[in-house]
Structures are given as C-alpha cells and as structure tokens.
Interface confidence: low
C-alpha cells in the first residue's frame, strides 16, 4: 500500500487552531511535474456533504512530502469529508477523513467501520441533542432510510447494513428530519472486495494474518497497519510517537499524538495513534489495553509490563507477543520445506531465526544449490525473532534445487533446507476457439494447449479489431470458464489472442498466436404488433406497439416506424433507436389523410418481419384564428365577447369555443359552444364580481381551428359571488362544455 | 377459446424414438414464442426447451440437448419436439406453453411419455 | 445456471388465513420471477409475472413482491379453491429455471 497518512488535529476549542496534514513516506513523493509525477492533493470534498461558503482554506507545502490545510474559521468549516491524494501512477491513493460536529444532534459511536464482502455492517448514531422526529439515513448523500425516532434502541438509532457488497462502500449519515445537515452523524464504511482473510482476483488468496490490528488489502494482500506499527505483519511498534510505514514520520507537538486522528488507505480507515482512544482522541488507553484506539489487549505473562503503545516489554529471558517464549540456542523459524519461484523473477525470500544472544542480520545467511552464499539485504528486528530478507538474483532453471538457510551466533548455530521449485511460464501453442458468435459479442473458449508449467491462475484475452493499431483490448477470465467479448461491432473481424498466467510474480506468458473472429448480425426474427394509436392534433399521431416478451436476449437494436400516405404515393420512415421503445410520437404528418401504418424491429442493417398494418385517417386542419377578439365588462357578473370571422375560410363554420379562465389561477380553463355561427358577439354570465378575466375562441369546421389572441377584462363591483360563468348570444341561452 | 392440445406421448423403450405435437387454436400461433415443459411422477416443473415466432431460434435444457430438436409449422399452428435416444429418466409429462410477457400463460393438458424396457 | 429455491416446501394453513411462500434466486434476476398455481392431474396455470403483475383473472387476494434474489407470494385470504402447488420460476437467462415447488394443505 502506498505511505500515505492524514493527520486531523481534533483541539476543537479553536477552529482556528484546527488543521489536517497530509504525510506521504513515498520516495519523492509530491514533486509535481517532475519524473516523479503528482504533487500531494489536500482539500475538502464538498460533493456529498457539502458547508456554507467561507474564506477559502490555506495550503502550506512542506518539502515535497507533506502538506498541510488551515484556516478554518468556524466549526462548521470543519464539518464534512476532507481527502488526500498522493502517490504517482497507479499507485495513486486517496485516504479519506469525515468531520464530525462535536455539537451534533446525533453522533456517530464509530466513525469509520471496515467490513468484509459478505458481512453485516452496523452503523451507530448516539442521541447527543435529542429531537422528537424521525431520523433520516442517507447513502453518498442520497435517501437510503428512514426510522421513527421512537425507535432508538439505548439512545443509539442503528442502521444495519446486511450482506455487504464493495458498492456499499461511502460516506452514510443520519439526520433528524429538517435539522440541519450539519447536526448529521457522518460514517464512513468501507467494504472490502473479499470475504474475511481472503484477498486477490477471485479473493482465492489468503492474507498473511495482520496483527497489532492491521488490515489486509483486498487487491494486493499487503497489511496497511494501524498508526505506529511495521513490518508486512504489522508485527514491530514503533517507538512512542512515531508513524508511517517504517516509522520514519514523528507526531508533531511536545503531546506526541495526543489528539491526533489518523487515517490510512483504505481499507483501513481512521483511527487514533497507538497508545490513544476516545472521540477526539485525548484519552490515555486504559491498564492493560494498547495500540490504535486502545482496542487490542496486553495479556502479558512471565512479568512482562503493558506498554500502551507497543504491548508487552519482556523481562530478560522472555520475549514473544505475550512473553510467553523463552530465550535460547538460535533457531530457524517457520521456514516452508518448499517455495515455488517463476523462471526470470528475482523474489524475495525471507528466513527468520531467534534465539539468545539475539541473531543480527549479518548473522543469517542463504546458500543456493551451486554453493552461492547470499547475504541478507534487510532484516526485520522484532522482540521474539529477526527477520532475514534475500533479493535473489534473476532466476534460471538450474536454480531448482535444494537451498539451505543458516544462523550462527555465539550461542550456536541451526540450519533449515528447503526446495525451490523454478517453473516456465505457460505459453499458449494455439489460438482460442469460437464457440458462438452474435452481432455484439463473441463467446470463446480460451484454454488451449500450451508449453511450460501450469496450474494456469488466469488467462487474458487480448483483443481489437482486424487491420486496426489501437491499443488491445483486454479481459482477465477464470481458466475454468468460457469468455463473452461484449460490446463488439456488428459483421467485423476482430484479431483474438490469449496470454495465460501461472500463480506468483512473474508468472504472465508469452502472448500466444492470434485467429481471426467476425461478428455476426442475425436477422430480427420477432414481429411487433400496433397495439394502439391517438391523434393527438391534426398532424402528430401516438403509436404504441408491443412484441412478445420472452426469455433471452433480444435480437435488435430499435424499430423501424413506416407511413405510407397513398394518395401522394409517398413513405415516411421514423427511426426508433431503443429496442426498450413501445411508444413513439409521430409529428409534422399531413392533416386530413389516410396513412397506413406498421412498425418493424431492425438489428444492425437488418429489417424483422413488419407488424400487421393499421389504417390511421388524421382529422384535417380547422379554419383560422377569429379576428379582433374584444372584451367588455357590462356588470359585476357579466362580459361581452366581439370578434369578427376568420378571413379565407375553407367550409362554413359549425360553431365557435370559448375559453374563460380567471387570470392568474391555477384551475382548469372552461369551454363555451357558441353554437350559432353567424354571431358575432356573446354575453359570458354567471362570472364573480371583482375579478380579471382571459377569454380567447376559435371557430370549428370538421377540426377545431386556431386559437384567436387572449383579452383580458375585469367584472364591475363587488356583488356576490356567482356560481359559474354561462353565456348568452343575444336573446338565447347556450350550453356549457368544460 | 385460446387452446393448445398435446398428442403423441406414449411407451417406449430406452434409446428409442417418439414425437410429440402441439395444436394451437384460437390466437395467431406465427406471432409466439412456444416452449415444451415436462414434469416426472411427482416431482416439480422442468424447462425443456424454447422456439421463436419463425423458428430461427431454438433453446434446449442441457439434459436434452443433442438429443431432442423442438420445431414448428406455423401454416399448421403446430408446435413438435422430435425425442431421440430416449432414457428412463425422460419419463414425464410433457406440456406444451405459449410464452408471452416473460412468463407461460397458456399450458396444454399435457402428454405421458413413458420410457421403459 | 441460476438455482431457485422455494421455502418452505410443505405448508399447511385453513380457510381465511394468510399465507407467503417465499423465492430465492441464486443470482440476481432482476423483476423476471412468475408465479404458476397447479392442482394435482392439471396442467400449471400462471398467477403472477414480472414479480408484481397479476395475470388476468387472477383473484387480488393473490399478490407478488421482490426484486434481485429474494421474491415472495402471498395470498391474503386462503380460499378452499387456493390449495395446491405453487412454483415460482425465473426468465431471466437461459435455462429457464423452476423451484422445487410448495405444497399448501389444508390443516
């Protein structure tokens, strides 16, 4: 895992005095633009929780490795999720810190939780400042649950989180309902990608069992080890004080890490500095307990004293995690009678000895089969044994054999044999095989043949189009399993070749041969039936269609709508590019004609079977717009309507409409007939007294024609209020129609 | 009234042959994915395989595939499964369904095949 | 292939009760779950597809709910005619899939 540490200085007396601090142990790392590559990124993530606007926050740089971010000057400031980013390449890693008010209503009994794939993760809102509403959680800022605030359970709202998978992974809240979000109990889960102890592709891999509370990576398998501890265990303490991954970084302030949170890549999260717990991490472990959050316990025997920041100190003659081992003639610990190494790596090998006096570096030795003595590069100091580290020089296949590693010290000496294995990488000596092909995906199986040694642990298809020189495209597919190659183009030749892997570094192939596999485009076989059709105007038609809905994939990329207008001898074709379609607008079609319509499903440049036809006859276009539309109040309940005809009318009007609609209002409009044609004035009745009116008409032939301008006009006086408005055209009453 | 009628089912010996058909009446059969489902003496429901509209697709559960071809002749509005190399553990009762909607909404009364020497 | 596992498999219950048969998917199969009710010497007859929606004249009293893996029946009020066998069964890929089926007896 990449030396990245955010330290967040929790004295909250003063924001002013609040700052985080951004620590990366890596070589050179945040440079910037040199060969090194990105600087260290600070800064505060507003995208979930998000504060007022205040003075923008100050960024110091110190060296290359270190940054640092003040100038808060309110709590509010503080509250939210802050991030660091650092590394370069794809080492890139962004560690995480969330924010808490101290002043919350609710309060979270443990920031961030680290859970395994699988597990039930439970998150904790404390009640600090109770209110009597419900309590709102919320997942990456989105509504996720609500509970009723009389279901507290201790004072405590829970928010239990069943078979977790790493999408769950985010920041969660809990809020009081309209309380402000800053009063929220901020979480932060953290989902690892592999059930409990396993990590890698397929988590088929055991983690080597983290100690002193140390997670095991998902993806790499390394330990990220809790703040002051080292070593790939996290087996050594660092001395009081220190951090980072080999201890090289020191707690700033004469209080050491005394209110200190730390927070470390994930999947470790955040937590106090060895030997400190509690909400702002101010409080001394208790007797007995030690490390990160005080959470692991001493147990010591054979006298051995409780250090709160490292544990067990031994008496002389003792040593072990609980001085529970005694001192003695050297001794090689735990070596495997057999390690397996791939042909041309250069691993790392690793022999631990104990004993008294203690073995040193120089006293651990490694001999390979042709008599070579290796000296140790590194050791790994720790209180019940030291922890040889080799870097053997590029393997050939004449180092398979027998290897020996050896202690010597004054108290004596122990040597362990053990077999290296040197195996060839496979190489596939054919190309992969097509099972079935469709326009968009090619199924193919790709364990074939191969030269050199298995097990095969995974098999990389690499694959692009024929002829092409873009980058290859490639999938990592268990051994066992057929591999789909989706998202292809339809009818085109794709060059495939498959690289297979052996277990262990170094363990990738030779690319094998490449063949040529061409997608296919078969013909849509399911025929669409026109399940309805409206007219929703004199020229736009609703079409709706259905197909039937069976098992399996659909073959089809959209539908193909066809209007053959008979009379023009012409064809309109409207494409609909989604095969989830079963609706469509058709618009701009010619008032009053007779179109036979029918739809088809298509997949690439191919047509299925066209539906039964419908015959769909428009309704024609209606007169135009009256003219002059005047309006004129005669009473506190009564409005006459003038107009004159529509010029250049295509057949005698049957009637005229008349829209009445209280200015302003939020109602439906009503519709008046004037049913006498000729007319052309109108008495609207019935309306309330002191109140603004809008009228428009539109006159009607076969179709409603075009609405004529809006007028508005108020009734007179302050009478009573009228049922309704009705309408009278001279001498005689006429219907309403709404 | 939508109807499918099964017929063809009977005795027959390990390793031999028999077809069953399916006739559709009452909705236009071209239009319809038709699948054969069977069901052992007192066991639960089991897929056996699938046909589209015109027939280019066919989909077979793998205890029968390679060794029974459904088929369909949608001028007859029939519906086939052609068995083959038949085994003990074919005996059921085979039904014929009309699929529509992601789900068999219509079901023959089904035909007995008994596979026994 | 995608295994359906029903539960319970035998259930006894009386006129008027309320009764759930619960169906679980091995992998997620989004809302592509239906529901079939069979009477001993008959062929299956469908109640529920795409989870939720209830065939045509289905009773109400019969209801489905359940998306991914986890999907249930339940039937309101347990009528003389409503015992039987039901299966649930799964559309989503191919081999089209059935569970083992729950029996509902009259206690």
């Known amino acids: 895992a990449v030396d990245l540490t955010l330290l967040a200085n929790l004295r909250l007396t003063d924001p002013q005095r609040f700052f985080l601090t951004c620590v990366s142990g890596e070589a050179g790392a945040g440079r910037g633009s040199d060969a090194w590559g990105p600087p260290l990124l600070l800064e505060k993530d507003d995208r979930i929780v998000r504060t007022p606007p205040g003075p923008p926050l100050r960024l110091a740089r110190n060296g290359s490795h270190q940054v640092t971010l003040r100038g808060f000057s309110k709590p509010s400031d503080l509250v939210g999720v802050f991030s660091c980013v650092g590394g370069a390449g794809a080492r890139r890693t962004r560690v995480i810190y969330v924010h808490n008010s101290p002043g919350a209503h609710l309060l979270p009994d443990k920031v961030t939780h680290t859970v395994n794939k699988g597990d039930t993760a439970v998150l904790s809102a404390r009640v600090h400042k109770e209110k009597q509403t419900d309590v709102i959680w919320k997942s990456n800022g989105s509504y996720f649950y609500t509970l009723d605030w009389h279901e507290a359970q201790d004072g405590r709202f829970l928010l239990q989180l069943p078979n977790v998978q790493p999408p769950s992974s985010g920041i969660y809240s809990a809020t009081y309902l309209e309380a402000s979000p800053l009063g929220s109990a901020f979480f932060r889960l953290i989902v690892r990608g592999c059930g409990a102890g396993r990590w890698g592709p397929g988590c088929t891999k055991e983690c080597p069992g983290c100690l002193h509370g140390g997670v095991c990576h998902d993806h790499d398998g390394e330990c990220v080890c809790p703040p002051g501890f080292t070593g790939t265990r996290c087996e050594q303490a660092c001395r009081e004080g220190r951090f980072g991954q080999s201890c090289q970084e020191q707690c700033p302030g004469i209080s050491g890490c005394r209110g200190l949170t730390f927070c470390l890549p994930d999947p470790y999260g955040c937590s106090c500095g060895s030997g400190w717990r509690g909400s702002q991490c101010q409080e001394a472990c208790a007797p007995g307990h030690f490390g990160a959050d005080c959470r692991l316990q001493c147990q010591c025997q054979n006298g051995g004293t409780c250090d709160r920041f490292s544990g067990c100190v031994c008496p002389s003659g003792w040593h072990g995690v609980h001085c529970e081992k005694s001192d003695r003639i050297p001794q090689i610990l735990n070596m495997a009678s057999e390690l397996e190494f791939n042909l041309e790596t250069m691993p790392r090998i690793n022999c631990a000895a104990a004993g008294n006096p203690f073995p040193v570096r120089g006293s651990i030795e490694l001999r390979k089969p042709d008599g070579t003595v290796l000296l140790s590069t590194k050791a790994i100091v720790e209180p019940e044994k030291t922890t040889a580290e080799f870097e053997v020089p590029r393997l050939v296949l004449a180092d398979s054999g027998f290897w020996e590693c050896r202690v010597s010290t004054s108290g004596g000496q122990d040597s362990r044999r053990f077999k290296v294995n040197v195996k060839v990488p496979p190489v596939p000596l054919a190309a992969p095989r097509l099972l079935t092909k469709q326009s968009r995906q090619l199924v193919v199986s790709p364990l074939v043949s191969f030269s050199g040694d298995g097990p095969i642990s995974t098999v990389r298809l690499h694959y692009r189009p024929q002829d092409s020189t873009m980058d290859w495209s490639t999938i990592v597919v268990d051994p066992s399993e057929n591999v789909t190659l989706m998202n292809l183009r339809p009818k085109t030749g794709y060059s495939v070749r498959v690289q297979l892997s052996r277990p262990g570094e170094g363990g990738e192939g030779a690319w094998g041969p490449p063949t040529l596999m061409t997608t296919d485009c078969p013909e849509p076989l399911l025929q669409p039936w026109l399940e309805g059709w409206h007219v929703e105007g004199t020229d736009r038609l609703r079409v709706s269609w259905s197909l039937p809905l069976v098992p399996g994939p659909l073959v089809g990329d959209g539908f193909l709508l066809r209007l053959w207008d008979g009379t023009r001898g012409q064809e309109r074709r409207e494409n609909v590019s989604s095969p989830q379609a079963r609706t469509a607008l058709l618009t701009g079609l010619t008032p009053g004609t007779h179109y036979q319509l029918d739809v088809q499903l298509y997949h690439c440049t191919l047509l299925g079977p066209a539906s039964p036809p419908a015959h769909v006859l428009l309704p024609p276009s209606g007169p135009p717009a009256p003219r002059h539309l005047h309006a004129q109040a005669l009473s506190d309940s009564e409005i006459q309507l003038t107009w004159k005809h529509p010029e250049a009318l295509p057949g005698p009007i049957s009637k005229y409409v008349v829209e009445v609609q209280v200015a302003g209002g939020a109602g439906d409009p009503l519709w008046i007939d004037v049913d006498r044609p000729e007319e052309t004035s109108t008495i609207i009745r019935g309306l309330n007294a002191s109140t603004r009116y809008l009228f428009r008409m539109r006159a009607s032939i076969q179709g409603l024609g075009d609405w004529s301008n809006t007028v508005e006009e108020s009734t007179l006086g302050n009478g009573l209020q009228a049922e309704g408005p009705v309408q009278e055209s001279r001498a005689a009453e006429e219907g309403l129609d709404q | 009234e939508v109807q499918l009628l099964e017929s063809g089912g009977g005795l027959v010996q390990p390793g031999g042959s028999l077809r069953l058909s399916c006739a559709a009446s009452g909705f236009t059969f071209s239009r319809y994915v038709m699948l054969w489902v069977r069901q052992a003496p007192g066991k639960g429901l089991e897929w056996v395989s699938v046909?589209?509209?015109?027939?280019?697709?066919?989909y077979y559960a793998d205890s029968v595939k390679g060794r029974f071809t459904i088929s369909r002749d949608n001028s007859k509005n029939t519906l086939y499964l052609q068995m083959n190399s038949l085994r003990a553990e074919d005996t059921a009762v085979y039904y014929c369904?009309?699929?529509?909607?992601?789900?068999?909404?219509?079901w023959g009364q089904g035909t007995m095949v008994t596979v026994s020497s | 292939d995608i295994q359906m596992t029903q539960s319970p498999s035998f259930l006894s219950a009386s006129v008027g009760d309320r009764v759930t048969i619960t169906c679980r998917a091995s992998?997620?199969?989004?809302?592509?779950l239906a529901w079939y009710q069979q009477k001993p010497g008959k062929a299956p007859k469908l109640l529920i597809y795409?989870?939720?929606t209830l065939q045509s004249g289905v009773p109400s009293r019969f209801s489905g709910s359940g998306s991914g893996t986890e999907f249930t029946l339940a039937i309101s009020t347990l009528q003389p005619e409503d015992f039987a066998t039901y299966y649930c069964q799964q559309l989503n890929s191919y081999p089209i899939t059935f569970g083992q089926g729950t029996r509902l007896e009259i206690k």
């Open positions: 795409a989870t939720s």
């Open positions: 046909i589209y509209p015109s027939g280019g697709y066919t």
């Open positions: 992998q997620g199969i989004s809302t592509y």
């Open positions: 369904a009309r699929g529509v909607l992601r789900a068999f909404d219509i």
